[in-house]
Amino acid sequence: GITIPRNPGCPNSEDKNFPRTVMVNLNIHNRNTNTNPKRSSDYYNRSTSPWNLHRNEDPERYPSVIWEAQCRHLGCINADGNVDYHMNSVPIQQEILVLRREPPHCPNSFRLEKILVSVGCTCVTPIVHHVQ
Amino acid sequence: GITIPRNPGCPNSEDKNFPRTVMVNLNIHNRNTNTNPKRSSDYYNRSTSPWNLHRNEDPERYPSVIWEAQCRHLGCINADGNVDYHMNSVPIQQEILVLRREPPHCPNSFRLEKILVSVGCTCVTPIVHHVQ
């Protein structure tokens, strides 16, 4: 088996809870990407299950701004531009990792958190429950 | 903008790149997200813009497995169950944070990375370019 030698180039944590507390480099790879979904595509308006994007801002979290989708209708837009309630607009959700300041207001101390966000909406055929 | 006051109860980073490198507590919040709708919905099959889920695996990243949506059709499924090419199935993309060990094999040093993933598909009206 492989035994990983202590790498002299590794940052050394003096924290007594090590390795529960680790160093994370926030110099993000691929940083210059457009985080505002409204700018990157207009699918939210052109979809048959259109959605509104709500800005969820929290200065105690990284990233501090997350855009949440909310479907505009219960049904879907048909070819005539009307809402068809025989179909359903539903949110597509994704679990993401975020960092939360802990203790609050500490500029360099965070806790990992998993949160569920709605990314957009899709139009689905409803599940019909037949009464026996 | 908000100026966060220096909290005397905060862990103090001696890192010269502060606050680029931060301390992160890995006792994750919401670890047991097993009632997570992302896991239990079958929208990928019931959508008018159905998608397949492809495994994107990287053992040196957390999460090691990320599922990428690929729209099954260029068009959307109509009421008769046929593909209607007057509409387009398009991927909804989301930027997510992942953790990567850096330097490799250092047990207490990570780097955040942003990656763009396709979470699902939605059906949109195509943009028609009229020839002048």
């Epitope: 088996g1 492989i2 990983i4 390795p19 529960r20 990992l112 | 890995l26 006792n27 994750i28 670890r31 097993n34 009632t35 896991r39 239990s40 919905s41 079958d42 990928y44 099959n45 889920l53 495994r55 695996e57 990287d58 053992p59 040196e60 990243r61 957390y62 999460p63 090691s64 497995v65 599922w67 953790l99 060990r101 094999h105 047990p107």
Partner: antibody
Framework: QVQLVQSGAEVKKPGSSVKVSCKAS????????ISWVRQAPGQGLEWMGS????????NYAQKFQGRVTITADESTSTAYMELSSLRSEDTAVYYC??????????WGQGTLVTVSS | DIQMTQSPSSLSASVGDRVTITCRAS??????LNWYQQKPGKAPKLLIY???SLQSGVPSRFSGSGSGTDFTLTISSLQPEDFAVYYC????????FGQGTKVEIK
């Protein structure tokens, strides 16, 4: 190629504890979880819990909560499963498996634990 | 916990036969369903993940289908090395396994 090599068979008395090890060879733990699954003689498979060695995150099946402890030592690429307050019904083959949090793709060879007075 | 029910619990078949095993979940699990093969005295082996994706190195005679609550494992042409116990497993919630289906020689 990832290989998970488990410790040898154990015979234990009721009320005692057992600690089974699982060493990853041919690669490090990487960012996967390690899950523990047991199989009583002639029975099916039962998930006990998991750990993500990178972070030390653990998740236990409700049935085993308070009786099982899963740990990992990254320096030796070894995961451990300790089961306490053993009873005869705990006689089983205990497997470790690499867990992507979606499926178990590599398994150890299994460790037979016999609980008998 | 999500209950997984396999049927049949055992079946007898001949080499070359087409074999189908079904698995039903007590609630919807999307496509988070895996199939494993286990031979006597050996650890389980992953065959199919995410309901229909073939794990690398697994012969193409194995296939999986289904979504929601009902799933199927099909062996298109049974080979001598396929006689074993097959388990389904969900990972929508904490993992649970079906009780197993034993495929025996007729």
């Amino acid at each position: 190629q990832v290989q998970l090599v488990q410790s040898g068979a154990e015979v234990k008395k009721p009320g005692s504890s057992v600690k089974v090890s699982c060493k990853a060879s041919g690669g490090t733990f990487s960012s996967y979880a390690i899950s523990w699954v047991r199989q009583a003689p002639g029975q099916g498979l039962e998930w006990m819990g998991s750990i993500i060695p990178w972070f030390g995150w653990t998740n236990y099946a409700q049935k085993f909560q308070g009786r099982v402890t899963i740990t990992a030592d990254e320096s030796t690429s070894t995961a451990y499963m300790e089961l306490s307050s053993l009873r005869s019904e705990d006689t089983a083959v205990y497997y470790c498996a690499r867990d992507s949090e979606y499926y178990f793709d590599h398994w150890g060879q299994g460790t037979l634990v016999t609980v008998s007075s | 916990d999500i209950q997984m029910t396999q049927s049949p619990s055992s079946l007898s078949a001949s080499v070359g036969d087409r074999v189908t095993i079904t698995c039903r979940a007590s609630q919807g699990i999307s496509n988070w369903l895996n199939w494993y093969q286990q031979k006597p005295g050996k650890a389980p082996k992953l065959l199919i993940y995410a309901a229909s994706s073939l794990q690398s190195g697994v012969p193409s005679r194995f296939s999986g289908s289904g979504s929601g609550t009902d799933f199927t494992l099909t062996i298109s042409s049974l080979q001598p090395e396929d006689f074993a116990v097959y388990y389904c497993q969900q990972y929508s919630d904490d993992p649970t396994f079906g009780q197993g289906t034993k495929v025996e020689i007729k």
